[in-house]
């Protein structure tokens, strides 16, 4: 299993660019055989995305050899039974890693697509598949999860309850001799071998067989394309080894014989021998989410999807997270407005990016010589004397409070306020006795004039919580 | 066609918490496009935004309403609930929960038909 | 938190009468204001978005104008279904705020 550059074609670029390491991821897509393989059409029979995928590290200017995929398996669950005729779906994307990555993240590569016969059950099937300069080789299988079994999943077994033989009117559930059929819900005969059901009391068969119990083999005249009937129990084969054989034809186009070699229908969008061509053009609508196409008026000529702000992907088909960069700062929420971003703030907060808290000091001052005090996850206010209010703009009476102690008298004053203490007091608000024995007594101030000393008086009131 | 469909008992006691959940039908509750959001009306006035809450359980409320609110989401249930803390008949409200887009431009485009709970003894 | 007034906070108008009404922010949020109608008993519904923007299906006499603080939401010509009343919210800045109200009612 590989994915490089097909042969003849020259030096092809590798799967990474010059902005350093990539990975491959494969994303595998089962459609319903009968649908169209147009991108847009759903994965209704399932989709899955490759896991554990290598590294690589090539850079342009080396030879991109075809390069080792992982072992690990792509398991693509399907629903209900399974159909035997189906699309197939492989793109291959590309993962850029790296710091300085930049640009698109993620690259749709490659896309091939189709149309496969299969029966479940069966062996591995080999197949290899090109499209622009790269081929693709892969291989592919369906297996029923048990209980089912058969071609189309569609019968169930159950583990024997005795060793050697099934209860009344079961069988043993070939391929699995240790386990039983479970009670049947087709129309009762409806071939085990040949037929399945989706519904109770219904008997539909596989490719080869027809009656209303899928017991007859097809007629030899329904066996197409020069092959002959087969014995009973396997319905028309080959006489031989045929130019279509394996389906040479890439993309899902169609293989038809033509005098000893063969010729390829290509669906739309596909050109070549081997429709192993990519033709998409900008007709074909290839960009999305609302990205512009430019260039691929003809199929000769390489489109590019433009993408609108907030997509990137060669197909604009990846939204990018622009988010995730966590732009916004103290818990703001980040708003991807498409033209822009946009920080959406937590209350408190301000600014482009929420950079600015509205309740600190830093650009918000306090009026009148007040001071800014922060706490508490808020911001205040501590008013001189003489002020008030949130911005101290305000003027207060600074004797309103009746701060002079001990029958001090309060008189307002250009700094704020004087206490005129009562006899036997003193300090700035009367606080202090003065000691009877009058050791420590000061002399006497001329009444009314005895001043608090500013600095003083500021420094307790800066560090004076209210 | 998104669906929001609020629930939760229609009588509440006074200093009891109320207790409401909206499920969203119709859409993934885990989209990276919108933020799920509470938003009551109590009768006769206006409108008043509670909170919101992101799928992966980021959550931004109205500090009005303090450390009363409680938003939580359960994605597998495709539910998000409200829960708000001694209750008081100023709490009596038609409770709405809406759908917000932050991605392209933001509104509430979704919105549930309401549910009124009163707050009585 | 940013304030939202809203005048005239009730009207009376006719139908086929143009009949407009303002918003105010108390501080700027660009065109980050969404218009809502509520009937009663109804839950709100989204009107205009982004200041201007119509929202799908909203018949086009309703247009949104206005940035920064000042805001207009117009009805071209007043219809039946649409007397009710009419929010404004700022989804600029958390905490989210809804302006009081207009109540559109019959002359």
């Known amino acids: 299993h590989s994915f490089g550059p097909g042969p003849g074609l020259g030096t092809p670029r590798s799967p990474c660019n010059a902005r350093g390491p990539c990975r491959l991821f494969f994303r595998v897509c089962l459609k319903p055989g009968v649908s169209q393989e147009a991108t847009e059409s759903l994965c209704a029979l399932g989709a899955a995305l490759s896991t554990s995928v290598p590294v690589y590290t090539e850079h342009p200017g080396e030879s991109a050899a075809a390069l080792p995929l992982p072992d690990g398996l792509v398991r693509v669950p399907f629903r209900d039974a399974w159909p035997g005729t189906f699309s197939l779906v492989i793109e291959t994307w590309r993962e850029q890693l790296g710091e300085h990555a930049g640009g698109p993240a993620w690259n749709l590569l490659a896309r091939v697509v189709g149309r496969r016969r299969l029966a479940a059950g069966g062996p591995w099937a080999r197949d290899v598949q090109r499209t622009g300069t790269w081929e693709l080789h892969f291989s592919y299988r369906a297996r029923c999860e048990p209980p089912a079994v058969g071609a189309a999943c569609a019968r169930l077994c159950r583990s024997r309850s005795a060793p050697s033989r099934c209860g009344p009117g079961l069988r043993p559930c070939t391929p699995f001799p240790d386990e039983c059929e479970a009670p049947s819900v087709c129309r009762p005969g409806c071939s085990p071998e040949h037929g399945y059901c989706e519904e109770p009391d219904e008997c539909r068969c596989l490719e080869g067989w027809t009656g209303p119990l899928c017991t007859v083999p097809v007629s030899t005249s329904s066996c197409l394309n020069s092959r002959v009937p087969g014995p009973a129990s396997t319905g028309c084969l080959l006489p031989g080894p045929g130019p279509c054989d394996g389906n040479p034809c890439a993309n899902g186009g169609s293989c038809s014989e033509t005098s000893g070699s063969f010729e390829c229908a290509c669906p739309r969008g596909f050109y070549g021998l081997r429709c192993e061509v990519s033709g998409v053009t900008c007709a074909d609508g290839p960009c999305f989410n609302g990205g512009l196409c430019v260039g691929g008026e003809d199929p000769d000529s390489a489109y590019v999807c433009h993408c609108p702000p907030g997509f990137q992907g060669s197909n604009c088909e990846k939204r990018v997270d622009r988010c995730s960069l966590q732009p916004c700062q103290n818990g703001g929420l980040c708003l991807d407005l498409g033209h822009a971003l946009r920080c959406r703030c937590r209350a408190g907060f301000a600014g482009p990016r929420c950079e600015h808290d509205l309740d600190d000091c830093a650009g918000r001052a306090c009026a009148n010589g007040g001071t800014c005090v922060e706490g508490g996850g808020s911001r205040r206010c501590s008013c001189a004397l003489g002020f008030g209010g949130r911005d101290c703009r305000e003027r207060a009476d600074p004797c309103a409070s009746r701060p002079c102690a001990h029958g001090g008298r309060c008189y307002a004053h250009f700094s704020g306020l004087v206490c005129a203490c009562a006899p036997g007091y003193m300090g700035v608000r009367c606080e202090f006795a003065v000691r009877p024995d009058g050791a420590d007594a000061v002399p006497a101030a001329p009444r009314g004039l005895r001043q608090a000393d500013p600095q003083r008086f500021l420094h307790h009131h800066h560090h004076h919580h209210h | 066609q998104l669906q929001l469909q609020e629930s939760g008992p229609g009588l509440v006691k006074p200093s009891e918490t109320l207790s409401l959940t909206c499920t969203v039908s119709g859409g993934s509750i885990s989209s990276s496009s919108y933020y799920w959001g509470w938003i009551r009306q109590p009768p006769g006035k206006g409108l008043e935004w509670i909170g919101s809450?992101?799928?992966?359980?980021?959550?931004y409320h109205n500090p009005s309403l303090k450390s009363r609110v409680s938003i939580s989401v359960d994605t597998s249930k495709n539910q998000f609930s409200l829960r708000l803390s001694s209750v008081t008949a100023a709490d009596t409200a038609v409770y709405y929960c809406?759908?917000?887009?932050?991605?392209?431009?933001?509104?509430?485009?979704?919105w549930g038909q309401g549910t009124l709970v009163t707050v009585s003894s | 938190a940013i304030q939202m007034t809203q005048s005239p906070s009730s009207l009376s108008a006719s139908v086929g009468d143009r009949v407009t009404i303002t918003c105010r922010a108390s501080q700027g949020i660009r065109n980050d204001l969404g218009w809502y109608q509520q009937k009663p008993g109804k839950a709100p519904e989204l009107l205009i978005y982004?200041?201007?923007s119509l929202q799908s299906g909203v018949p086009s006499r309703f247009s949104g104008s206005g940035s920064g603080t000042d805001f207009t939401l117009t009805i071209s010509s007043l219809q039946p279904e649409d007397f009710a009343t009419y929010y404004c919210?700022?989804?600029?800045?958390?905490?989210?705020?809804f302006g009081p109200g207009t109540k559109v009612d019959i002359k």
């Open positions: 919210l700022q989804d600029y800045n958390y905490p989210l705020t």
């Open positions: 982004a200041a201007s």
């Open positions: 809450i992101y799928y992966s359980g980021n959550i």
């Open positions: 809406a759908r917000e887009i932050i991605v392209g431009a933001t509104h509430f485009d979704y």
